[in-house]
């Protein structure tokens, strides 16, 4: 099985124990590590951070001791903006220039492939996204002709039904991608006005339609029915939780909220907590399991957080094995307890290790 793990370059800027550099990663933990994110400037793939080249080097030296490890560079992301991607993909010349710039950049910096993180193509970009993938793959095939190992091509796709329907021609893009990471998280957010788990495995009894589509099982099944081969589908598992501030004394699933949860000490983003911050939060919190959805949530005071733990990730891995998927994807290594100092287990990357162990289990 593949274990595809994202590392985010901005995690270097977190304070103190939250700061994560690629040299803190375990070279034997994942089969693929994806560095997020690269930029596109003047239609050419480019660095984003001032020290990306140094960090690329740090990441790719992990392969010295584990030659089986593959590294990919992810281009795009939330801050890149869908419109910018759209402009490049919809213009033949810009698209060509971008595609041509990729292989030399990846080879120069020691990456084994490219991950496309266009978040997200609009309904009018659907065809252009397909063309971008098809032409990128053709370029990778051509570039590998002189006996080089062919560069890998993957894409991170939304698990939201509306985005799947409007943005992706699943059957066509699947033909050209080496694997697809389906982002089976962020199904629920503060915009709903109520508490809810952002990455349920199954639809819960609490989920009235239209929430019937907001779960991992539906998204994976739908992708498969749309023509994604199970052998290319990698299922996303979050090492972060989504938090809410409760608006009343109700604390269950579907309880009213006044907004996102308070920012974490390190990640400093309202409504999001890294797993290592959740381990802190759990001291003195009340933990519940949403039985139908097979995921936990915890409450403390007026704070509510839905997250994944070692038990829920094992359920998810068993599910993806039952579905005969290609493996699991983790967003993100730097949100797991990468130092092993927060979750009291004397184990670095406890969630990712639980995923790895479950994948390896017979």
């Amino acid at each position: 099985y593949k274990l595809v793990c994202y590392y985010t370059s901005w995690s270097q800027y977190r304070e103190g124990d939250g700061s994560c550099f690629p040299d803190a990663l375990d070279r034997f933990l994942c089969t693929h590590i994806i560095y997020s994110f690269a930029n596109i400037s003047n239609d050419h793939i480019d660095t984003w951070e001032w020290n990306d080249v140094t960090l690329y080097g740090m990441l790719n030296t992990l392969k010295n001791r584990n030659p089986n490890l593959k590294t990919l560079l992810s281009v795009g992301g939330w801050n890149f903006g869908s419109q910018r991607f759209s402009k490049i993909a919809s213009n033949t010349q810009s698209r060509r220039t971008f595609i041509k710039s990729v292989p030399p950049f990846l080879r120069t910096h020691g990456f084994d492939g490219l991950d496309l993180a266009w978040l997200y193509p609009g309904r009018r970009d659907k065809q252009h996204f397909t063309t971008l993938i098809k032409e990128m793959k053709a370029e990778f095939i051509k570039e590998a002709q002189p006996g080089k190992k062919q560069l890998l091509l993957s894409a991170a796709l939304s698990a939201g039904k509306v985005t799947i329907d409007s943005s992706y021609d699943i059957a066509k893009i699947s033909q050209h991608l080496d694997f697809i990471s389906i982002m089976t998280y962020d199904f629920h957010g503060a915009w709903r006005g109520t508490t809810g788990h952002h990455s349920p495995l199954f639809r819960g009894q609490e989920d009235a339609s239209p929430d019937r589509f907001s779960n991992t099982d539906y998204a994976v099944g739908y992708m498969l029915r749309l023509g994604a081969p199970a052998s290319k589908l990698v299922m996303g598992i979050p090492t972060f939780g989504r938090s809410f501030t409760l608006a009343s004394s109700e604390t269950g699933v579907g309880a009213p909220i006044s907004g996102p949860g308070i920012p974490g000490r390190f990640t400093k983003e309202a409504g999001t907590l890294a797993y290592y911050e959740i381990c802190d939060f759990l001291r003195g919190a009340t933990v519940h399991r949403i039985l139908g959805q097979q995921v936990p949530y915890a409450t403390k005071g007026n704070q509510w957080v839905g997250y994944d733990d070692q038990e829920s990730v094992k359920s998810k891995v068993q599910y993806l094995k039952d579905r005969q998927l290609a493996g699991a994807m983790v967003w993100a290594l730097d949100l797991d307890d990468f130092q092993g100092s927060f979750c009291g287990q004397d184990l670095r990357f406890p969630l990712t290790n639980a995923i790895k162990d479950a994948l390896a289990a017979t």
Partner: antibody, heavy 122, light 108 residues
Framework: EVQLVQSGAGVKKPGATVKISCKVS????????MHWVQQAPGKGLEWMGL????????IYAEKFQGRVTITADTSTDTAYMELSSLRSEDTAVYYC???????????????WGQGTLVTVSS | SYELTQPPSVSVSPGQTASITCSGD??????ASWYQQKPGQSPVLVIY???KRPSGVPERFSGSTSGNTATLTISGTQAMDEAAYYC??????????FGGGTQLTVLG
């Protein structure tokens, strides 16, 4: 206020071609797909096809493929549906319909024209 | 042949609850929408995304979906609700498809 105003009723001979217009107001014409729906007398609704006014791209239902042409004129904010090789079973009310631009994926139609009756008779 | 199957007619007494069903394999994967059409008028959207009601549609109209069956429920049915009702869904293979329609008759 969103309005879709269609051209008037008409009688056509078998084998002829009919072209119906649908003029929109109250929203940006290029923001959303324009669909056409057929309703034969006493029968149900049947989706015929759509045009994306932004780029003129069309999708047609298999049943009407080859006989229907849907176009959009952005200079007048008007969509057109042309149906050729008319036969008696094409006698129907034809509606233009669109979905609100608030939705990224147009699963449904929340604005409809008043309908245009086309009678095919020799 | 319709991808979405509706009963041709449903009768209800005023003040009672009317339920109109729509079944089809695509509904397990797709949102259901419902339209009301009165004689000589254009269809009007009454439910979209399974359960959502456009502004201006009375609260007595509600929708639900379970498995491959969508249901339009009209509670406290009034004489003015007498009309034809059509379910509709989108699917990657069939594009936009309508059910055959159900004529709702309000007795009395």
């Amino acid at each position: 206020e969103v309005q879709l105003v269609q051209s008037g009723a008409g009688v056509k001979k078998p084998g002829a071609t009919v072209k119906i217009s649908c003029k929109v107001s109250g929203y940006t014409f290029t923001d959303y797909y324009m669909h056409w729906v057929q309703q034969a007398p006493g029968k149900g609704l049947e989706w015929m096809g759509l045009v994306d006014p932004e780029d003129g791209e069309t999708i047609y239902a298999e049943k009407f493929q080859g006989r229907v042409t849907i176009t959009a004129d952005t200079s007048t904010d008007t969509a057109y549906m042309e149906l050729s090789s008319l036969r008696s079973e094409d006698t129907a009310v034809y509606y233009c319909a669109t979905a609100s631009p608030r939705e990224e994926m147009p699963y449904y139609f929340d604005y409809w024209g008043q309908g245009t009756l086309v009678t095919v008779s020799s | 042949s319709y991808e979405l199957t509706q009963p041709p007619s449903v009768s209800v007494s005023p003040g009672q609850t009317a339920s109109i069903t729509c079944s089809g394999d695509i509904l397990a994967d797709q949102y259901a929408s419902w339209y009301q059409q009165k004689p000589g008028q254009s269809p009007v959207l009454v439910i979209y995304h399974d359960t959502k009601r456009p502004s201006g549609v009375p609260e007595r109209f509600s929708g639900s979906t379970s498995g491959n069956t969508a249901t339009l429920t009209i509670s406290g049915t009034q004489a003015m609700d007498e009309a034809a009702y059509y379910c509709q869904a989108w699917d990657i293979n069939t594009a936009w498809v309508f059910g055959g329609g159900t004529q709702l008759t309000v007795l009395g």
